[in-house]
Structures are given as structure tokens and as C-alpha cells.
Interface confidence: low
């Protein structure tokens, strides 16, 4: 990759090793200013693989609230509005970064954590295993 | 909410204000050990709203590589394998947290940033506006 010269105005760090402890400003910068927050708000209901959203709360995590998608059906909704079990509703999962308080209950010390969340559901053709 | 007593072993913090700077250990803890690695590997191809994945790289961000989904079609794939334009393929988007180097090019100083990524696509019934 490209080697970028270190900024001389960087804060000092005593620990030069990786894994390392870094300083993080929790004043979140939001790059999503041009997005319409309503745009995908009803996909969960209009999808052929609809899903429900469940609240997952953990005060020791930042962000403390994460919404998890759970597919409503094993099959997908067909043109008649019925569930077609020849197709499968499956969760689309994504790994996300969260901050975990470490040591526990500390307001100013965190560890980076990777968790798997279900973001929504999609309709897929099932894999059929043919027995010889 | 429940007030959790502060752990007496917490690191000291000089800045008690919010927005605040915190210490974060970048040694990522992975909570996803029980996931089946095959489970979602080919949904992008098998979905009725298939998508391609594009690499988004930014050395000033952590993680530096994020993969973005882009729906292949405006419509959805029907049972005959053709694109049905009476339905719409739409991206499922999620806001995720990343770390942005701040000041730029600093190895040990970051700011939390929220970005919107497309994780995959789902097939939805279109909203039809009838003109009076």
C-alpha cells in the first residue's frame, strides 16, 4: 500500500506495538447527511422476504442499542401474497465494529469488538442436494 | 436506566466533558466464533435481487477496506431466470461505525465516524403512484 508520512502534530503514543491502545474522539462525525432516512424504512415490510426488527440493548457496549433483523418466514412471498416454500428467506449478515467497555463499567476505556448482526433479509433459490 | 458503579480500576481521564476522548484497545475481540462460515457466502448470487460487491479502500479509515453491495438489476429475477421489472431490487443499507484518523495520517489518534453502507439487496414490491 501507499506509505503516508506521519503528521508531526500527532499525539504521542507510548505503545508502538500492535495490538495497541489509541485515542478516539467519541464526537461522532456523520457522513450520511445527504441520505434520506425514510428511504429504506419500509423495505422490511415490502420485501418478498420481509423481516421484523428486534432491539438489542447492552449498556456496556457503544452503541448500546442495535437493531437485529429476523426473517418472518422460511419461504418468500409470491405474487399472490402467499408464502412460497420453494424459495428461502435468509438474513443478510454483516460484521460491525462496536466499542466494549473494558475494564467493565469504565466510562473512558474501551476495546474494539466485532459482532455479527442481521441487517435485513433476501430471497434466495435453495440449494437442493440430490441423493445418488 | 440502571446506574452501574464505576470500576475503581478504570484508567484516569483528564477530560470529563462530552464529546470526550477515550482510550480504545484495537486488539479486536471477535464474538462471532459460532457462525457457520458457509452460511451466507453465496447469497449475493442466489438472491432474486442479486448484487455485486465493490471494494472501498481508504487508508485514513479503520477498517481500511469495506465491501459495498450494488444491486445488479432494477428488477428482480423471476422463476424463469429473467428480470421482472414489476418488482424492484433495492439495497439494504446500514449505518456502521468506523474510526477516522484525526489529525490525518496519525497512527494513534482517531475520531468515531458513522457511514452508510449497502450490505446486500432485497426484492420489494414497488410503490405505484396513481395520477388522478
Amino acid at each position: 500500500g501507499i506509505t503516508i508520512p506521519r503528521n508531526p502534530g500527532c499525539p504521542n503514543s507510548e505503545d508502538k506495538n500492535f495490538p495497541r491502545t489509541v485515542m478516539v474522539n467519541l464526537n461522532i462525525h456523520n457522513r450520511n447527511t445527504n441520505t434520506n432516512p425514510k428511504r429504506s424504512s419500509d423495505y422490511y415490510n415490502r420485501s418478498t422476504s420481509p423481516w421484523n426488527l428486534h432491539r438489542n440493548e447492552d449498556p456496556e457496549r457503544y452503541p448500546s442499542v442495535i437493531w437485529e433483523a429476523k426473517c418472518r418466514h422460511l419461504g418468500c412471498i409470491n405474487a399472490d401474497g402467499n408464502v412460497d416454500y420453494h424459495m428461502n428467506s435468509v438474513p443478510i449478515q454483516q460484521e460491525i465494529l462496536v466499542l466494549r467497555r473494558e475494564p467493565p463499567h469504565c466510562p473512558n476505556s474501551f476495546r474494539l469488538e466485532k459482532i455479527l448482526v442481521s441487517v435485513g433479509c433476501t430471497c434466495v433459490t435453495p440449494i437442493v442436494h440430490h441423493v445418488a | 436506566g440502571i446506574t452501574i458503579p464505576r470500576n475503581p480500576g478504570c484508567p484516569n481521564s483528564e477530560d470529563k466533558n462530552f464529546p470526550r476522548t477515550v482510550m480504545v484497545n484495537l486488539n479486536i475481540h471477535n464474538r462471532n466464533t459460532n457462525t457457520n462460515p458457509k452460511r451466507s457466502s453465496d447469497y449475493y448470487n442466489r438472491s432474486t435481487s442479486p448484487w455485486n460487491l465493490h471494494r472501498n479502500e481508504d487508508p485514513e479509515r479503520y477498517p481500511s477496506v469495506i465491501w459495498e453491495a450494488k444491486c445488479r438489476h432494477l428488477g428482480c429475477i423471476n422463476a424463469d431466470g429473467n428480470v421482472d421489472y414489476h418488482m424492484n431490487s433495492v439495497p439494504i443499507q446500514q449505518e456502521i461505525l468506523v474510526l477516522r484518523r484525526e489529525p490525518p495520517h496519525c497512527p494513534n489518534s482517531f475520531r468515531l465516524e458513522k457511514i452508510l453502507v449497502s450490505v446486500g439487496c432485497t426484492c420489494v414490491t414497488p410503490i405505484v403512484h396513481h395520477v388522478a
Epitope: 460484521e95 455479527l116 | 458457509k38 457466502s41 460487491l53 465491501w67 456502521i96
Partner: nanobody, 119 residues
Framework: EVQLVESGGGLVQPGGSLRLSCAAS????????MYWVRQAPGKGLEWVAS????????YYVDSVKGRFTISRDNAKNSLYLQMNSLRAEDTAVYYC????????????WGQGTLVTVSS
């Protein structure tokens, strides 16, 4: 720190062969399914092949079946892709990836190795 380093790419004529290697470190290699994926110029990512932890199960995208063979050596923390009967449409940057290829959030990918098939 997870590291994946691919090698073995290069320029080859149609019908030729190449063997790609991926050296893994920073995680328990034998505990993860591994993947080869590729990205042709200006195109989206395409999954090519995957192999289970113990090498017992292998999967291939239809376009490479019978031509490509994925293998692994857990003792050496290495993943391989033997590519035979190469075609122009196999031209791409090839990446090895750890675990599932979705979601694609973490940079558990190498920088890739370029394979160019041209006469």
C-alpha cells in the same frame, strides 16, 4: 494481526496455467473456511472457490469448475489455487479471504495478486 499475502500471479497465455498461494498469519488457520475471490477490471467481486477447515469440502463457481483446484496446507498456514486452461475472462485481481466472504466489512484480505491472461 490477521495477515493474508497472495502470490503467484502474472501474465500467462490462454490455455496456460498458474498456481496462486496465500500465506496466512495472525489467526488459527485450521479453524476457518477459506476463499478465493476475484475482481476483474471495472467489475464487481466474484467468488471463485472455497474450502472447508479440514479440506474435506470444496466449492467452485460454475465458470471455473474442472479448470481450477483449491487446496490448503494447514501445517503451513497456506491456501492454494491451481489454475489450468486459463481464459481471457479469468483476468482479474485474485484475493484470498478468511471465513465467510459476506459480510465484507473487515480487511481480512490481502492486497491481491494480478492474473492477466492474454496472447
Amino acid at each position: 494481526e490477521v495477515q493474508l499475502v497472495e502470490s503467484g500471479g502474472g501474465l500467462v497465455q490462454p490455455g496456460g496455467s498458474l498456481r496462486l498461494s496465500c500465506a496466512a498469519s495472525g489467526f488459527t488457520f485450521s479453524s476457518y473456511g477459506m476463499y478465493w475471490v476475484r475482481q476483474a477490471p471495472g467489475k464487481g467481486l466474484e467468488w471463485v472457490a472455497s474450502i472447508e477447515q479440514d479440506g474435506s469440502e470444496k466449492y467452485y463457481v460454475d465458470s471455473v469448475k474442472g479448470r481450477f483446484t483449491i487446496s490448503r496446507d494447514n501445517a503451513k498456514n497456506s491456501l492454494y489455487l491451481q489454475m489450468n486452461s486459463l481464459r481471457a475472462e479469468d483476468t482479474a485481481v485474485y484475493y484470498c479471504a478468511k471465513g465467510e466472504i459476506l459480510p465484507l466489512y473487515f480487511d481480512y484480505w490481502g492486497q491481491g495478486t494480478l492474473v492477466t491472461v492474454s496472447s
